[in-house]
Interface confidence: low
Amino acid sequence: TGADTEAVVCVGTACYTAHSGKLSAAEAQNHCNQNGGNLATVKSKEEAQHVQRVLAQLLRREAALTARMSKFWIGLQREKGKCLDPSLPLKGFSWVGGGEDTPYSNWHKELRNSCISKRCVSLLLDLSQPLLPSRLPKWSEGPCGSPGSPGSNIEGFVCKFSFKGMCRPLALGGPGQVTYTTPFQTTSSSLEAVPFASAANVACGEGDKDETQSHYFLCKEKAPDVFDWGSSGPLCVSPKYGCNFNNGGCHQDCFEGGDGSFLCGCRPGFRLLDDLVTCASRNPCSSSPCRGGATCVLGPHGKNYTCRCPQGYQLDSSQLDCVDVDECQDSPCAQECVNTPGGFRCECWVGYEPGGPGEGACQDVDECALGRSPCAQGCTNTDGSFHCSCEEGYVLAGEDGTQCQDVDECVGPGGPLCDSLCFNTQGSFHCGCLPGWVLAPNGVSCTMGPVSLGPPSGPPDEEDKGEKEGSTVPRAATASPTRGPEGTPKATPTTSRPSLSSDAPITSAPLKMLAPSGSPGVWREPSIHHATAASGPQEPAGGDSSVATQNNDGTDGQK
């Protein structure tokens, strides 16, 4: 699908063109780019009105559209992987031609956060409504489309072309037709301003080929910031009409001579320019000599002028242009200062947030506050940061040091703590004995008991578990002599295994291990090897495991 230029609006130092055609955002940008422009910016309410005007022009010429809502790409995009920033007017989007984050925005609805794919913005037009100030086109964010799949309901796009300056449209003093050809390859017979380097073709006469005269002009920069056609006097003048046709092509007054000839003149306070058509104010400010947002202020008796800058800007060396003042040089912020056009903003380092006494102050974020702690167990807030700690029987783990991992006391550096069987539990351990042995009152040693061929002696009673003093962590796994269904041993969710002292006589019998709270009870046989897998909560090794693992505080441990 191609794209047709249907409409053009030139104002200030920019031209906007509107095109119809179902293109992806990249194809639309490429189309604008080929002619030296970009997808249009909408950086202010005024610019939104210019864009709306060119769209209205396009829609007036377009065969009536049957869609009530229509979308047109503009140059606002967010790259893949860049996330939404709700604090900014552009929400983390940026203009394709570059430039600052601008204060104006007109979002259609609340944006959903998604960093996965590239997102592009289109103007959403309600074609059923007149163009009212309250109905400036809304910004709609969505997928950027692709060739052959341009995006849902995209009708076209708007380009913007920027120029050094503009010429006034040529004025005709008699019948004729002007055709302007712009540097961005648009032809038009009616432009309110004609961009620098445009060509004008003037065909005089009422259409009879014999009478037609042609003139060709180029919009040139005559002097710094002064643009004109280099023509003198009204074009296509005819004694038949004199001043009666289009005021003789004169900007202000037209004076007729008796022979049908005429001259252009100006009202008091104005002077006739070199083109002998246009009038300019004698007021030196009327030529808008000040640039970059500077205001022209007349001197005494209206003879000279000075330029004045808005707050946050200062005059440059030319004394005509305003440049941004870098307020950050005065260190107005407690931590970070970001210079912006006409101002600045204070930001806080990671671990701090705006607040506290004074402008631009930052205060510590209490990461350990209720409901926001990133730690699995203990959390200590520090200035600008925090650190996590673990209860007895656990050590810090995880890439970010926020998780707590069970210490496997059964494979501790001092060797086994139990004389015979050692059962590691979440945050603790306890000892057991082989058949024919019973656990001594110290909970560690085994003493010879009555001869039995049953399973190993189970866990001690509640009151004589070998738990470490002061441990408040509930035991996550216990050993039990009971067999599984049909006597079949099953896998267990815990990665810690009961260990056997290597010199003890072994009688194999399955033990029921209860999974951590919230997980199904599953089965595993005791092992004669010391545990080699990391103990504590761990993801199942893969596959379709039905075992759920969970931290003891129920958090996912993400900081």
């Epitope: 009105q49 210019h50 709306q52 005007r53 209205a56 829609l59 007036r60 065969a63 009536a64 559209l65 049957t66 009530r68 037009l125 074609l127 059923s128 007149p130 163009l131 009212l132 100030p133």
Partner: antibody, heavy 120, light 111 residues
């Protein structure tokens, strides 16, 4: 050529309802909005409301909400306006008129009008 | 609602002369460079006919002796030179805001 055809007259009793029709021809019916305008004898023009034939969206002048109901039949390219609970105040000529779909919605084609007389 | 006041209510103009009809809006009907003001002509027993749209654009098929001008709140319809067939009532209409409203009309007689 582009035409909007309306029946010449309707005579109705007070309290009754009437459904006026406006048949479009010579253009794509769903590409233009259809408006209805009231003109009392010797008086000016009053806009009643508009309907988008493609999706049946309607916008009404608050003054006529509850009095007029606009509908369309796309298959016959006909727009309708039902007037309910008629009184002598509703005696008028009712015009249908089309407008472009976007921007300045001036009425470029008008029907000849239907004269509604409310009388017992 | 935007109220449109037309003046004069009626006028009589000699054949070949200029007829000027004014329409004042209670608030601006301009937006982004366009004026949402339209002019219609209505003859007895006939529907209104579009003459001028967007303040100054001549509808196709309308003679060039009809012209419109103005912006904001003040608009004018000019007919020059007036012809016999121009005897009618002329209405201005704004389409900038709902409800669309019409002026009270100006009756033009040819002397």
């Amino acid at each position: 050529q582009v035409q909007l055809q309306q029946p010449g007259a309707e005579l109705v009793k007070p309290g009754a309802s009437v459904k006026l029709s406006c048949k479009a021809s010579g253009y794509t019916f769903t590409s233009y909005w259809m408006h209805w305008v009231k003109q009392r004898p010797g008086q000016g023009l009053e806009w009643i409301g508009e309907i988008d034939p493609s999706a049946s969206y309607t916008y009404y002048n608050q003054k006529f909400k509850g009095k007029a109901t606009l509908t369309v039949d796309k298959s016959s390219s006909t727009a309708y306006m039902q007037l309910s609970s008629l009184t002598s105040e509703d005696s008028a000529v009712y015009y249908c008129a089309r407008s472009v779909y976007y921007g300045n919605k001036y009425f470029d084609v008008w029907g000849a009008g239907t004269t509604v007389t409310v009388s017992s | 609602d935007i109220v449109l006041t037309q003046s004069p209510a009626s006028l009589a103009v000699s054949l070949g002369q200029r007829a000027t009809i004014s329409c004042k809006a209670s608030q601006s009907v301009d937006y982004a460079g366009d004026s949402y003001m339209n002019w219609y002509q209505q003859k007895p027993g006939q529907p209104p006919k579009l003459l001028i749209y967007a303040a100054s654009n001549l509808e196709s098929g309308i003679p060039a002796r009809f012209s419109g001008s103005g912006s904001g709140t003040d608009f004018t319809l000019n007919i020059h030179p007036v012809e016999e067939e121009d005897a009618a009532t002329y209405y201005c209409q704004q389409t900038n805001e709902d409800p669309r409203t019409f002026g009270g009309g100006t009756k033009l007689e040819i002397k």
